[in-house]
């Protein structure tokens, strides 16, 4: 009764198509698969960035797989062949591992890469990234930004740089069609006549770096003798009302400070007849139903009511 064995896949490699971190892992069927002609072979693929504690594992019937990686670090992957018991008329069989690695040979020392990279997707409409030049780089150093997301044929270079002292220190992106809820890859590389410049790679999803506009049209409405309803409108732009959280700051008579976080465009405030002045400001942020993270907007213009009529009438600006 000979033990059934199967070979690992052949020609296992990681291919970089130039998408700034979105890589192809590909392989060929194992040698001597003829014994298993009537059999659907599966492959277990494990991969990670070097230095990561955990492997990502997938099983596929295909000869390729694609995923995103951090190109600031190396990548390691391993794969083996899996035969379900139906292939062997006995128990499951797995091959030994085939292994491969990939890394971009780093140029320049780490200090030469851009510092403090910061990207904000303003009002879910305009992406702006800014950075500081690397430590100790000369004024002849210039940085170039490239970006890619699924849907683009190839990586694109920034066409509208923000400059300071002749150096690129940021990028204003064009309209990015169908670019949210998917990984957005950026590479900032550089050139200098004096020394090589280290490239930097960044990956994020645009919906998670949105900074909305502040809310508008703040109003007061007297609900009862001891209640005032504060109302505002969602900021102009493409972000739907269901995507907002709000933070309110309310001051009564320059002393009491109330802060609250709410999900819709109203807040009811308990007041006393002694209240002489009421002011509030609101800011907005994309909520957990539409993103995993976000940036608070600036505070709205302050809306105040002063005077003795506070307890009697509807209050508008």
């Amino acid at each position: 009764d000979t033990e059934i064995k199967v070979n690992p896949p052949q020609d296992f490699e990681i291919v970089d198509p130039g998408y700034l971190g979105y890589l192809y892992l590909q392989w060929q069927p194992p040698l001597s698969l003829d014994h298993f002609k009537e059999c659907t072979v599966e492959y277990e693929l494990k991969y990670r960035n070097i230095g990561s504690e955990t492997w990502k594992t997938i099983i596929t019937k295909n000869l390729h797989y694609k995923d995103g990686f951090d190109l600031n670090k190396g990548i390691e992957a391993k794969i083996h062949t899996l035969l379900p018991w139906q292939c062997t008329n006995g128990s499951e069989v797995q091959s030994s591992w085939a292994e491969t690695t990939y890394w971009i040979s780093p140029q320049g020392i780490p200090e030469t890469k851009v510092q403090d990279m910061d990207c904000v997707y303003y009002n879910w409409q305009y992406l702006l990234c800014s950075w500081k030049p690397g430590i100790g780089v000369l004024l002849d150093t210039n940085y170039n930004l490239f970006y890619w997301y699924e849907g683009l044929d190839h990586a694109l270079q920034c066409v509208d740089y923000i400059k300071a002292d002749g150096q690129n220190i940021g990028c204003r992106f064009p309209y990015l069609e169908a670019s949210d809820y998917k990984d957005f890859y950026i590479c900032v590389n550089g050139s200098s006549e004096n020394k090589p410049i280290r490239s930097s790679y960044f990956t994020f999803q645009l919906q998670n770096i949105v900074k909305p506009l502040p809310p508008v049209y703040l109003t007061f409405t007297r609900e009862s003798s001891c209640e005032i309803k504060l109302k505002w409108s969602i900021p102009l732009g493409p972000i739907p009302a269901r995507c907002f959280d709000y933070e309110i700051e309310i001051r009564e008579d320059d002393t009491t400070l109330v802060t609250a976080t709410v999900e819709n465009e109203t807040y009811t405030l308990k007041t006393t007849n002694e209240t002489r002045q009421l002011c509030f400001v609101v800011r907005s942020k994309v909520n957990i139903y539409c993103s995993d993270d976000g940036i608070w907007s600036e505070w709205s213009d302050k809306q105040c009511w002063e005077g003795e009529d506070l307890s009697k009438k509807t209050l508008l600006r």
Epitope: I58, K61, W85, S91
Partner: antibody
Framework: EVQLLESGGGLVQPGGSLRLSCAAS????????MGWVRQAPGKGLEWVSG????????YYADSVKGRFTISRDNSKNTLYLQMNSLRAEDTAVYYC??????WGAGAFDYWGQGTLVTVSS | DIQMTQSPSTLSASVGDRVTITCRAS??????LAWYQQKPGKAPKLLIY???SLESGVPSRFSGSGSGTEFTLTISSLQPDDFATYYC??????????FGQGTKVEIK
């Protein structure tokens, strides 16, 4: 006749634990990959976890990874799902299912009747 | 992850009608697709595997077709017992195994 019989469901508080069992009969249990699929009230089907046959390789949905553990005892023809750190969103009917063909998952040709897990304070 | 999208979400039909449900995968899954039928309070039941293979014991009025990203389940002549919810499921690459959101076939 293939039969899968789940047990172990019930009411548990958030943060609590439960262990589901699935007793299998009518087929050579150790040969087949098995899985757990759940269905929240009024919702669709969601795959939770899978395990290969004799090798026992395990696979999980991201939503339960690190909290749930699938295992099997081939000598007892039983599949298990240990559920820790339960959350309200884990409330569902949990089905045990047999994989028709494949290493760790595939088309599920037989299903148990399901056991209800309710996570609520 | 591979997303599976079914259409329509709800389908109103009469006994004897020819009914077609569509399932679309977010990337190619070759023919690694299954179809299930589920009735209220019951476990799902496998109808079709490998996109077009009829599971043993399933009536021949059920058929599956398609490959790559577009798949269909067809009921050639709807019977009273067929009013249920139908799910597609991919098993090309996992984890996770993914299901469509379901199509409810109801009486017109």
């Amino acid at each position: 006749e293939v039969q899968l019989l789940e047990s172990g469901g019930g009411l548990v508080q958030p943060g609590g634990s439960l262990r589901l069992s699935c007793a299998a009969s009518g087929f050579t249990f150790r040969k087949y990959a098995m899985g757990w699929v759940r269905q929240a009230p009024g919702k669709g089907l969601e795959w939770v976890s899978g395990i290969s046959g004799s090798v026992g390789s395990t696979y999980y949905a991201d939503s339960v990874k690190g909290r749930f553990t699938i295992s099997r005892d081939n000598s007892k023809n039983t599949l298990y799902l240990q559920m820790n750190s339960l959350r309200a969103e884990d409330t569902a009917v949990y089905y045990c299912a047999k994989v028709r063909y494949g290493w760790g998952a595939g088309a599920f040709d037989y299903w148990g009747q399901g056991t209800l897990v309710t996570v609520s304070s | 992850d591979i997303q599976m999208t079914q259409s329509p979400s709800t389908l109103s039909a009469s006994v004897g009608d020819r009914v077609t449900i569509t399932c679309r995968a977010s990337q190619s899954i070759s023919s690694w697709l299954a179809w299930y039928q589920q009735k209220p309070g019951k476990a799902p039941k496998l109808l079709i595997y490998d996109a077009s293979s009829l599971e043993s014991g399933v009536p021949s009025r059920f058929s599956g077709s398609g490959s790559g990203t577009e798949f269909t389940l067809t009921i050639s002549s709807l019977q009273p017992d067929d009013f249920a919810t139908y799910y597609c499921q991919q098993y090309d690459t996992y984890p996770p195994i993914t299901f469509g959101q379901g199509t409810k076939v109801e009486i017109k």
